[in-house]
């Protein structure tokens, strides 16, 4: 969490951002809130990016003002216009690119004063893993697949019964480049699994951590997946 305060001149207002991560090819949110103001027509929101000449986005007098917008963000940004009056300056970024990573500034002017806060935005790819029993294999084998990751993650297997065990000798992980030549498909196979046990396939890079669990018993198979972004710090 980053909390910024206003600059000299008018009163300062509190602006708060939260570091976040964007998933390449999907839409992302750059989070920013500020002390609300009931005078909507006086509110100005500017999003800037370090190293970029033009603005990322500008909202003033109740609407987008995009004449100064940088080419790299053209047609890809929007604020939640209906939420500005209650202090939400968050930016929606469409079709996140690898190059969108960097330091952003959320700069706010209201009738009460000015304020700004920076935000670190990471970009990459992350997806939920799915763990299945591989019936084609000669021995009891689990196959963990996740369609899109970048940068290349690490994959670690764990088991509820054999807690702390190292499965690197009985697992094999491969990374296959996807058609857009950036993200990769992750496939990890675990051999010699035992019945009545819960296995977890954990995939992690510097942006996200995802876990796929599978419980195999005589009568049924239960699966569960979970994904967590690693760098959500407020400012």
């Amino acid at each position: 969490l980053i909390i910024g305060f206003g600059i000299s001149g008018r009163h300062s207002i509190t602006v708060t951002t939260v570091a976040s991560a964007g998933n390449i090819g999907e839409d992302g949110i750059l989070s920013c809130t500020f002390e609300p103001d009931i005078k909507l027509s006086d509110i100005v929101i500017q999003w800037l990016k370090e190293g970029v000449l033009g603005l990322v986005h500008e909202f003033k007098e109740g609407k987008d003002e995009l004449s100064e917008q940088d080419e790299m963000f053209r047609g890809r940004t929007a604020v939640f216009a209906d939420q500005v009056i209650v202090g939400n300056a968050s930016l929606r970024l469409k079709n996140v690119q690898l190059t969108d990573a960097g330091t952003y500034k959320c700069y706010i002017i209201t009738s009460k004063g000015k304020g700004n806060a920076n935000l670190e935005y990471k970009t990459g790819a992350f997806s939920m893993p799915e763990v299945n029993v591989d019936y084609n294999a000669s021995s009891e084998t689990l196959r963990c697949e996740a369609p899109r990751w970048f940068p290349q993650p690490t994959v670690v297997w764990a088991s509820q019964v054999d807690q702390g065990a190292n499965f690197s000798e009985v697992s094999n992980t491969s990374f296959e480049l996807n058609s857009e030549n950036v993200t990769m498909k992750v496939v990890s196979v675990l051999y010699n699994v035992t019945i009545n046990n819960t296995y977890s396939c954990m995939i992690e890079n510097d942006i996200a951590k995802a876990t796929g669990d599978i419980k195999v018993t005589e009568s049924e198979i239960k699966r569960r997946s979970h994904l967590q972004l690693l760098n959500s710090k407020a400012s």
């Epitope: 002390e35 609300p36 009931i38 005078k39 909507l40 027509s41 006086d42 007098e61 109740g62 609407k63 216009a81 209906d82 939420q83 009056i85 209650v86 202090g87 009738s111 009460k112």
Partner: antibody, heavy 117, light 107 residues
Framework: QVQLVQSGAEVKKPGASVKVSCKVS????????MHWVRQAPGQGLEWMGA????????EYAQKFQGRVTLTADTSTSTAYMELSSLRSEDTATYYC??????????WGQGTTVTVSS | DIQMTQSPSSLSASVGDRVTITCQAT??????LNWYQQKPGKPPKFLIY???QLAEGVPSRFSGSGSGTDYTLTISSLQSEDFATYYC?????????FGGGTKVEIK
């Protein structure tokens, strides 16, 4: 869930003052504006003013400037509206209304103030 | 201050009718307009925000539209529980101002 609970009906004499309370629960009281709107019998809605409890910032409609005072007690999440120098045309129902997710999204049940000699 | 002119001030309609209420602002309010429904002895109920977005729990027979200075609330098929007074509110310019109200009565 969000609730705005106002104090009970009041009967006042001309020239007196009235203080209406509005107790809030269900959202962070200090971080969002609380407004006051009144409605005379059979009439429309009229905005009176607003307070930002976190900093006690206030904004008043010009018509009520100098006669209305908005305050907030952050320890009890209660907003207050005091109207002084009452006259018969101040007979109305007074509402508190929040701007939490949107402008005037939640309303108190209303407090009837009758000014009569 | 921005003036909001609401019309008609009252109308009579039957269950199943399509009802349209308009609000005109004295200047561009950039879609910063909400609609409220009020029944006798009750506080106003939040209906539509930012011109066209339905508040939580509001039936889909209600819809809002408009831009610039002209805005409309439409009830596609009037139900018995919709007989009430409707108000528009602009919050673009300070101070926020309400329309005069439209009373929807049973024909």
């Amino acid at each position: 869930q969000v609730q705005l609970v106002q104090s009970g009906a009041e009967v006042k004499k001309p020239g007196a003052s009235v203080k209406v309370s509005c107790k809030v629960s269900g959202y962070p009281f200090t971080s969002y504006y609380m407004h006051w709107v009144r409605q005379a019998p059979g009439q429309g809605l009229e905005w009176m003013g607003a307070i930002y409890p976190g900093k006690s910032d206030t904004e008043y409609a010009q018509k009520f400037q100098g006669r209305v005072t908005l305050t907030a007690d952050t320890s009890t999440s209660t907003a207050y509206m005091e109207l002084s120098s009452l006259r018969s045309e101040d007979t109305a129902t007074y509402y508190c209304t929040s701007t939490w997710t949107h402008y005037f999204d939640y309303w108190g049940q209303g407090t009837t103030v009758t000014v009569s000699s | 201050d921005i003036q909001m002119t609401q019309s008609p001030s009252s109308l009579s309609a039957s269950v199943g009718d399509r009802v349209t209420i308009t609000c005109q602002a004295t200047q561009d309010i950039v879609k910063s307009l909400n609609w409220y429904q009020q029944k006798p002895g009750k506080p106003p109920k939040f209906l539509i925000y930012y011109t066209a977005q339905l508040a939580e729990g509001v039936p889909s027979r209600f819809s809002g539209s408009g831009s610039g200075t002209d805005y409309t609330l439409t009830i596609s098929s009037l139900q018995s529980e919709d007989f009430a007074t409707y108000y528009c509110l602009q919050f673009y310019e300070f101070p926020p101002t309400f329309g005069g109200g439209t009373k929807v009565e049973i024909k």
